[in-house]
């Protein structure tokens, strides 16, 4: 089939007093592969500090995924969730207070 | 994408050091994380930390004592102060931007020596 | 510190040959690894990224492979501008650490 861009979706949750899980999830996508990450100034965090999901199936023809990682309250500017999917690519920042971000794609 | 590092090529022991790195091509405001990297002769490299785009900075522990990067958004440069310096801080010294996973482009590094 | 263990530390090949740098981590770097090219007069370019992703204008001589704490860079077919000194770095870990580079030479 053709290529059909992910809707990229970026939510927080209080993790612990002083931290909050950021999680970047991607929807809506074919084909599966797909580079997602957190970032931190532009630098990709560790390996060890974050969590992904399996690429699944979402019943649609396409597939999702996910990636969780834990910051300090405070310093959500700094974090960035990078999404590389058919050879566009596109950063997305962590919303503030309880809102949530959702978009297509873009160069 | 542009990087060229300048400063004084000798510097004497105690005293600080202290570089530019000057970025064409891109806004150090932009995104990505800007570096110094330094390679002593013999060949090793050393990061020394970076300024994101957003102002933060990270140092390596090693140096974190001596070291401070700063930047001027209005010419799009960014610096780096080295204090107490002494010869083993002899070194060529090098900026780059830290994109995603790597640096992805380089000054071509300024020599710097220490001595009296 | 992650220490990252480079060999050769030179190597004289001849033109068309294929050549092999290996670069060994201390601890598992999860594909966090990347190799530059240092010409004689200093300048460094990025070559490999993230194992074996090609940066944009890289001959398509050069690859990467490797993972946990092994990983290497191949030249398909050695060409006179090869000539240089090539490293590895680690981005997993923080401080990034450097390989003590690969001078390649010409036979």
């Known amino acids: 089939g053709s290529t059909v861009p992910p809707m990229v979706n970026v939510t927080r949750s209080e993790a612990s007093e002083g931290n909050i899980t950021v999680t970047c999830r991607a929807s809506g996508f074919y084909p599966w592969n797909i580079t997602l990450s957190w970032r931190q100034d532009g630098v990709s965090l560790s390996h060890d500090t974050q969590q992904w999901g399996d690429v699944l199936p979402d019943g649609n023809g396409t597939y999702q995924t996910w990636v969780a990682t834990r910051i300090c309250q405070g310093e959500e500017q700094r974090f960035t969730c990078y999404m590389e999917h058919s050879g566009n690519h596109s950063t997305h920042p962590v919303p503030s207070g309880n809102s949530h971000h959702h978009h297509h794609h873009h160069h | 994408v542009q990087l060229q590092e300048s400063g004084p090529g000798l510097v004497k022991p105690s005293q600080s050091l202290s570089l530019t790195c000057n970025v064409t091509g891109y806004s150090i405001t932009g995104d990505y994380a800007w570096n110094w990297i330094r390679q002593f002769p013999g060949n090793k490299l050393e990061w020394i930390g970076y300024?994101?785009?957003?102002?933060?900075?990270t140092y390596n522990p090693s140096l974190k004592s001596r070291v401070s990067i700063t930047r001027d958004t209005s010419k799009n440069q960014f610096f780096l102060q080295l204090n107490s310096v002494t010869p083993e801080d002899t070194a060529t010294y090098y900026c780059?931007?830290?994109?995603?996973?790597?640096?992805?482009?380089w000054g071509l590094g300024t020599s710097v020596t220490v001595s009296s | 510190d992650i220490q990252m263990t480079q060999t050769p530390s030179s190597l004289s090949a001849s033109l068309g040959d294929r050549v092999t740098i290996s670069c060994r981590a201390n601890q598992d770097i999860s594909h966090y690894l990347n190799w530059y090219q240092q010409k004689p007069d200093g300048a460094v370019k990025l070559l490999i990224y993230y194992t074996s992703r090609i940066h944009s204008g890289v001959p398509s001589r050069f690859s990467g492979s490797g993972s946990g704490t092994d990983y290497s860079l191949t030249i398909a077919n050695l060409e006179q501008e090869d000539v240089a000194t090539y490293f590895c770095?680690?981005?997993?870990?923080?401080?990034?650490?450097f390989g003590g580079g690969t001078k390649v030479e010409i036979k």
């Open positions: 770095q680690q981005g997993n870990t923080p401080p990034t650490t």
């Open positions: 300024i994101g785009y957003t102002g933060s900075t």
């Open positions: 780059a931007r830290w994109r995603n996973w790597a640096m992805d482009y």
